[in-house]
């Protein structure tokens, strides 16, 4: 590159204590240097601004990828909120239904327990009543034993 | 640093008025500047070449991070999503399971109305019945009287 | 820009072709370049360390907020997790329910048949009983028998 | 001290070639504009050639142009003349001096004799 | 290129006499004058740089003057080692060009 080229031989420009005028030559190689530094630089600069502006140009594109992404992770935080509470009313709302079956599980125990006494009531008048009949004076006017005599064999 | 230094003394060069020739000892001042300032360059463009690479690696590890963030973003989303999906699938199914047991109530509530006058019935009949025994012709073919009369009672 | 100058008038130091000495005002126009050249690199790389220093703090900045919004995402992804199990214990409980609801109906459905079978059972008895009581020997001693008969019917 | 020591010069035909050498050594070479000079037998001094002390400017007599070529070799402390298409009127001893600005050719080697002839 | 005129081409002297040896340019040099010595078989050797200035080791008996276009060599008491030829050369400008010299000879 112009900028790293070896400056090297003007160092030591006639180390001896004459004075010696400088050759036009040496101030033309001079001139070429830092006409070419100039060049460099300006190059560079060039270059420089361009890559920083590219740099910047993504940094905004970043910021903005950066509000969205957040947005996006806000709304998310938020669904997710509104989504906790719809399980939470979910939760109370099964929990609910669940004492509800619990209750009505209760409720259908006790009404069994009923329905074996109103069973067992109900097969004892059965057998009561078949004693009933058929204790009856044998009559051709009481047709109703035999029926009901069928009805409980 | 060399890109710093006071470069002012080439303002007077040559002290001699009459001079037409540029003295050795002043191109020498030059050619260091020129020198330095090439070095100072050379810093610099190293340099800032070396940030600039450090800063596009950064705004590329930025990027692929990004990327990840998004995707993350984008599965958290979409879980979300599901999730939202699941827990009205839950809200219906909760609300069938409510109706449901709303229902089974209702029959429950029936079933015991049911019950209570199935009770009032069979309470009449035992009544009758007992009253029907205790009024028959007292016969010792009738043992059961004693016996319904007890179970009544 | 000084960095921007035309340095072209280098090239042709010194009208005299024939001179090998460089004239004073020649080094004096390279001197005067230089120092140009060395103020605009000097404005360069401080406007440029400028920017890169920008740069760095807004590539600091991101990395914060990458992390913050990384360690947001984390936890939207834990808080989901819990949500999905959270929900995976609500449709567990919901199915518990829900089969309870049908053992319960199932359990209802039966003793609905049991309370028909026993209905049927209560009327039978009721229409023996009946046809009992009007087949009895007409006698004062049984009052029952008008108040069965209109129970009945 | 300062010395310099020419080589290479012998006959050559006419349209031949002949490089020339010249080693210095008790001062900074790399410092120094070098320049050969000829002086034809019985004749007066010529100046020929002569390099900038980083061997990129260079500059030649018209008689010379485009047939001879400096060079140098600071790494070597050595200057040389290429000479091709030589004539009879390029005999001459051939020296090598150092060339201070404006305080002239304070330094000579003691020559070397170039003869162009069929 | 500038044209160095060199006056007498050659010139009988004795010890002891005091001799000039001129130089004209055909163009203003200032001072960029410089004056050789050359004897038979040997290199030539700067005695005078810039017009007046002695080259280390030369004889102060030697001296230079003139500027501009016009300029003379002067040996004070010539000294037998003196007769030799001499060659002025300008270093204004390029091509570098020498005098056609002066041979000083013992009468």
């Known amino acids: 590159s112009r900028i790293d080229q070896d400056n090297s031989s003007f160092d030591s420009l006639s180390p001896e204590p004459k004075s010696r005028f400088a050759m036009l030559d040496d101030v033309k190689i001079l001139a070429n240097g830092l006409l070419q530094l100039g060049h460099g630089l300006k190059d560079f600069v060039h270059k420089t601004k361009g890559q920083i502006n590219d740099i910047f140009q993504k940094l905004n594109i970043f910021d903005q990828s950066f509000y969205d992404l957040s947005l996006q992770t806000s709304e998310i935080k938020e669904e997710e909120k509104e989504l906790r509470r719809t399980t939470y009313k979910l939760q109370v709302k099964n929990e609910e239904v669940k004492n509800m079956s619990l209750e009505l599980n209760s409720k259908l125990e006790s009404l069994l327990e009923e329905k074996i006494l109103l069973q067992q009531k109900v097969k004892y008048l059965e057998e009561q009543l078949t004693n009933l009949i058929q204790n009856q004076p044998e009559t051709p006017e009481h047709p109703e034993v035999t029926s009901l005599k069928t009805f409980v064999e | 640093s060399r890109i710093d230094q006071d470069n002012s003394s080439f303002d007077s060069l040559s002290p001699e008025p009459k001079s037409r020739f540029a003295m050795l000892d002043d191109v020498k001042i030059l050619a260091n500047g020129l020198l330095q300032l090439g070095h100072g360059l050379k810093d610099f463009v190293h340099k800032t070449k070396g940030q600039i690479n450090d800063i596009f690696q950064k705004l590329n590890i930025f990027d692929q991070s990004f990327y990840d963030l998004s995707l993350q973003t984008s599965e958290i989303k979409e879980e979300e999503k599901e999730l939202r999906r699941t827990t009205y699938k839950l809200q219906v199914k909760n609300e069938e399971v409510k109706n449901m047991s709303l229902e089974l109530n209702s029959k429950l509530e029936s079933l015991l109305e049911e019950k209570i006058l199935l009770q009032q019935k069979v309470k009449y009949l035992e009544e009758q019945l007992t009253n029907l025994i205790q009024n028959q012709p007292e016969t010792p073919e009738h043992p059961e009287v004693t016996s319904l009369k007890t179970f009544v009672e | 820009s000084r960095i921007d100058q035309d340095n072209s008038s280098f090239d042709s130091l010194s009208p005299e072709p024939k001179s090998r000495f460089a004239m004073l005002d020649d080094v004096k126009i390279l001197a005067n370049g230089l120092l140009q050249l060395g103020h605009g690199l000097k404005d360069f790389v401080h406007k440029t360390k400028g920017q890169i220093n920008d740069i760095f703090q807004k590539l600091n900045i991101f990395d914060q907020s990458f992390y913050d919004l990384s360690l947001q995402t984390s936890e939207i992804k834990e808080e989901e997790k819990e949500l999905r199990r959270t929900t995976y214990k609500l449709q567990v409980k919901n199915e518990e329910v829900k089969n309870m609801s049908l053992e319960l109906n199932s359990k209802l459905e039966s003793l609905l048949e049991e309370k028909i079978l026993l209905q049927q059972k209560v009327k039978y008895l009721e229409e023996q009983l009946t046809n009992l009581i009007q087949n009895q020997p007409e006698t004062p001693e049984h009052p029952e028998v008008t108040s069965l008969k209109t129970f009945v019917e | 001290q300062v010395q310099l020591v020419e080589s290479g010069g012998g006959l050559v035909k006419p349209g031949g070639s002949l490089r020339l050498s010249c080693a210095a050594s008790g001062f900074t070479f790399s410092d120094y504009y070098m320049s050969w000079i000829r002086q034809a037998p019985g004749k007066g001094l010529e100046w020929v050639s002569y390099?900038?002390?980083?061997?990129?400017?260079?500059y030649y007599a018209d008689s010379v142009k485009g047939r001879f070529t400096i060079s140098r070799d600071n790494a070597k402390n050595s200057l040389y003349l290429e000479m091709n298409s030589l004539r009879a009127e390029d005999t001459a001893v051939y020296y090598c001096?150092?060339?201070?600005?404006?305080?002239?050719?304070?330094?000579w080697g003691q020559g070397t004799l170039v003869t162009v002839s069929s | 290129d500038i044209q160095m005129t060199q006056s007498p081409s050659s010139l009988s002297a004795s010890v002891g006499d005091r001799v000039t040896i001129t130089c004209r340019t055909s163009?203003?040099?200032?001072?960029?004058l410089n004056w050789y010595q050359q004897k038979p078989g040997k290199a030539p050797k700067l005695l005078i740089y810039t017009t007046s200035t002695l080259q280390s080791g030369v004889p102060s008996r030697f001296s230079g003057s003139g500027s501009g276009t016009d300029f003379t060599l002067s040996i004070n008491s010539l000294q037998p080692e003196d007769f030799a030829t001499y060659f002025c050369?300008?270093?204004?400008?390029?091509?570098?060009?020498f005098g056609g010299g002066t041979k000083l000879e013992i009468k």
């Open positions: 050369q300008q270093t204004y400008s390029n091509p570098l060009t």
């Open positions: 390099i900038g002390s980083s061997g990129v400017n260079m």
């Open positions: 163009q203003n040099i200032i001072n960029f």
């Open positions: 001096a150092r060339d201070s600005s404006q305080l002239g050719f304070d330094y």
